[in-house]
């Protein structure tokens, strides 16, 4: 409807630059709504050019605000199902006009870009897009090209006779996989491509295409040097070469056919219809996802852009899949956020790509005092007394084996375990019998010490229970606090990176 | 001229609220990702949070140390990112910049936020 | 959070004289950092990015180096407007974060 510049913007703006007449060309490109990003590099469910611009010329003290706008529709043939969601792309173009060094020179005025939802056969949408101060009003919708029908325009089916195949030449048809594709009424030879027909022995031509069968492409600008003009109502015909022959692309950009014209793939630096264009600054904006513009600083230099993590391509504007770098180490699973990669680990793995192995001595030690021992590949705690489990962390009862001898009685104690012994027994676990009458001690004192006095013996027994008890408890109490501590940074790593994971997810 | 002019700051009581507001001129602003970053009396840089474009649905990402009070948004025709920053503490006491891009290319002058009894 | 820390904290050199300026990450970080100058009073700019590569306008005197987690800004010789205060930044993993920034002071 209109392209000008945006209301409250002081002094309406002429797209020509003061620099003589410019013509105002709109490109409308048509992507796959299913990525976030809705930029990558190809227009893959098509794209147009606005024909038929009238030249704008900026006479002093005109407003600016009505330019005149190419007349009538821009059509986007599209060939598959109708996907309901997509992305619009809508860049203005200016074409400077007149003695230019090197002939006309083409600027991005503006692009605007945005995710639809729309299903075809519905009525126009209206809409205005603001981009830096130019705005943009302009409608669209979907419609479908008979044969096809239907919100998704899907090719006109009928229902299965047999459920497991088609009739003869038929093919399942590709929405419906329960239908099958009606039987050609079209006249023998026309295009399935580019021709549809409503009547019998009919072949009608998409937009794009002409002559008996729609095989020969329409050229979307006025016929140049050896093209044969058509009739008035089809444009240009092109006998035989295809859209890409010649390469039209310049400064090393490469072509591919779009239903029926052609696109350019510019290498980066260079933008336009056929990348003859350098004239975007850095200043415009053109590096996708907070790519870092460098260069670029005047229309007549090239830009870079240095990508974000994640994403390539010369404007940043494909995503990378960087979990198929398999950055997670010992099976962790990659989850690829965007903004930063995160692996998932496996039990037994830690750290930022799950390279510490915790079955390891090196990695998590064993809890509640207990000693790492490693052999044959695998990690194995030895616990202290009163902890069992794998890593120590269950409390096991130390008086569940019955280490007390001769009717001695177990008493569990935060170290250990405590013997009281029978009457006429010593000895940690009362395994000393002691005579009555004060004589030696049997079975199992050392020999040195038989003919000693039994009271000195108890006593020399007593300190040496103590000194053990306390080496024990301060030894429990050293590893306790040590491998806590190293516990402690490891699960708080841990929680920190799941908590992470489940915040980024969410955002 | 890339110009990021920032302005809103001033003193605030804690618990209070203040609206800074970040005007750009000589770039296409509708394609630029902003941040805002502080930077405390005397400290480093904080990333503060970042709105992308309309494009991405206007997503915004926050530091942990605002997330929940801090608010960003931004108007494409008016050229303005906001930074809506409520129930603000004493640590909350920085210079204030707006910044472009994933990488930080152009800076604001940047405007001062006092947070004070 | 990656942290990133700076050293040395100030470092006192005459005009004309070399600077090396060194950064170090807590986990690998590639060459996703990038080095602001900053002058009292003034916003920080934008130096080095991608670890070694000079943003527009940059002289040459400035370079960066590094990869993984060790990182180095050097300036070839002082001239009189490069005494500022230098961060390094990591773009790695999001959130970015800042080093906490070497002095380079005049001696």
């Known amino acids: 409807h209109s392209f000008g510049p945006g209301p409250g913007l002081g002094t309406p703006r002429s797209p020509c630059n003061a620099r003589g007449p410019c013509r105002l060309f709109f490109r409308v490109c048509l992507k796959p709504g299913v990525s976030q990003e809705a930029t990558e590099s190809l227009c893959a469910l098509g794209a147009a050019l606005s024909t038929s611009v009238p030249v704008y010329t900026e006479h002093p003290g005109e407003s600016a605000a009505a330019l005149p706008l190419p007349d009538g529709l821009v059509r986007v043939p599209f060939r598959d199902a109708w996907p309901g969601t997509f992305s619009l792309v809508i860049e203005t173009w200016r074409e400077q006009l007149g003695e230019h060094a090197g002939g006309p020179a083409w600027n991005l005025l503006a692009r605007v870009v945005g995710r639809r939802r729309l299903a075809a056969g519905g009525p126009w949408a209206r809409d205005v897009q603001r981009t830096g101060t130019w705005e943009l009003h302009f409608s669209y919708r979907a419609r479908c090209e008979p044969p096809a029908v239907g919100a998704a325009c899907a090719r006109l089916c009928r229902s299965r006779s047999a459920p497991s195949r088609c009739g003869p030449g038929l093919r399942p048809c590709t929405p419906f996989p329960d239908e099958c594709e009606a039987p050609s009424v079209c006249r023998p030879g026309c295009s399935p491509e580019h021709g549809y027909c409503e009547e019998p022995d009919e072949c009608r031509c998409l937009e794009g295409w002409t002559g008996p069968l729609c095989t020969v492409p329409v050229s979307t600008s006025s016929c140049l040097n050896s093209r044969v003009p058509g009739p008035a109502s089809t444009g240009c015909l092109l006998p035989g070469p295809g859209p890409c022959d010649g390469n039209p692309c310049a400064n090393g950009g490469s072509c591919s056919e779009t239903s029926g014209s052609f696109e350019c793939a510019c290498p980066r630096g260079f933008y336009g219809l056929r990348c003859e264009v350098s004239g975007v600054t850095c200043a415009d904006g053109p590096c996708f996802n907070g790519g870092l513009c460098v260069g670029g600083e005047d229309p007549d230099s090239a830009y870079v852009c240095h990508c974000p993590p994640g994403f390539q391509g010369s404007n940043c504007e494909k995503r990378v899949d960087r979990c198929s770098l398999q950055p997670c180490q010992n099976g962790g699973l990659c989850l690829d956020l965007g903004h930063a990669l995160r692996c998932r680990c496996r039990a037994g793995f830690a750290g930022p790509r799950c390279e510490h192995d915790l079955d390891d001595c090196a990695g998590r030690a064993c809890a509640n005092g207990g000693t790492c021992v490693e052999g044959g590949g695998s990690r194995r705690c030895s616990c202290a007394l009163g902890f069992g489990g794998r890593d120590c962390r269950e409390r096991a009862d130390p008086c569940a084996s019955r280490p007390c001898a001769h009717g001695g009685r177990c008493y569990a104690h935060f170290s250990g375990l405590v013997c009281a012994c029978a009457p006429g027994y010593m000895g940690v676990r009362c395994e000393f019998a002691v005579r009555p009458d004060g004589a030696d001690a049997v079975p199992a004192a050392p020999r040195g010490l038989r003919q000693a006095d039994p009271q000195r013996f108890l006593a020399g027994v007593i300190a040496v229970i103590v000194v053990v008890v306390i080496a024990i408890v301060a030894g429990i109490v050293v590893l306790v606090i040590s491998r806590k501590k190293r516990m402690a940074k490891y699960e708080k790593a841990e929680i920190k990176e799941m908590g992470e994971m489940h915040r980024e997810l969410n955002a | 001229e890339v110009q990021l002019v920032e302005s809103g700051g001033g003193l605030v009581k804690p618990g209070g609220s203040l609206r800074l507001s970040c005007a750009a001129s000589?770039?296409?602003?509708?394609?630029?990702?902003m941040n805002w970053v502080r930077q405390a009396p005397e400290k480093g840089l904080e990333w503060v949070g970042q709105i992308r474009l309309k494009s991405d649905d206007y997503a915004t990402h926050y530091a942990e140390s605002v997330k929940g009070r801090f608010t960003i948004s931004r108007e494409d025709s008016k050229n303005t990112v906001y930074l809506q920053m409520n129930s603000l503490k004493t640590e909350d006491t920085a210079v204030y910049y707006c910044?472009?891009?994933?990488?930080?290319?152009?800076w604001g002058q940047g405007t001062t936020v006092t947070v004070s009894s | 959070n990656i942290v990133l820390t700076q050293s040395p904290a100030t470092l006192s050199l005459s005009p004309g004289e070399r600077a090396t300026l060194s950064c170090k990450a807590s986990?690998?970080?590639?060459?996703?950092v990038s080095w602001f100058q900053q002058k009292p009073g003034q916003s920080p700019r934008l130096l080095i990015y991608g670890a070694s590569n000079r943003y527009t306008g940059i002289p040459a005197r400035f370079s960066g180096s590094g990869s993984g987690t060790d990182f180095t800004l050097t300036i070839s010789s002082l001239e009189p407007e490069d005494f500022a205060v230098y961060y390094c930044g990591q773009f790695y993993s999001f959130p970015s974060t800042f080093g906490g920034g070497t002095k380079v002071e005049i001696k």
């Open positions: 986990e690998n970080v590639g060459t996703y």
């Open positions: 910044t472009t891009g994933y990488y930080f290319d152009y």
């Open positions: 000589g770039i296409t602003f509708s394609n630029f990702w």
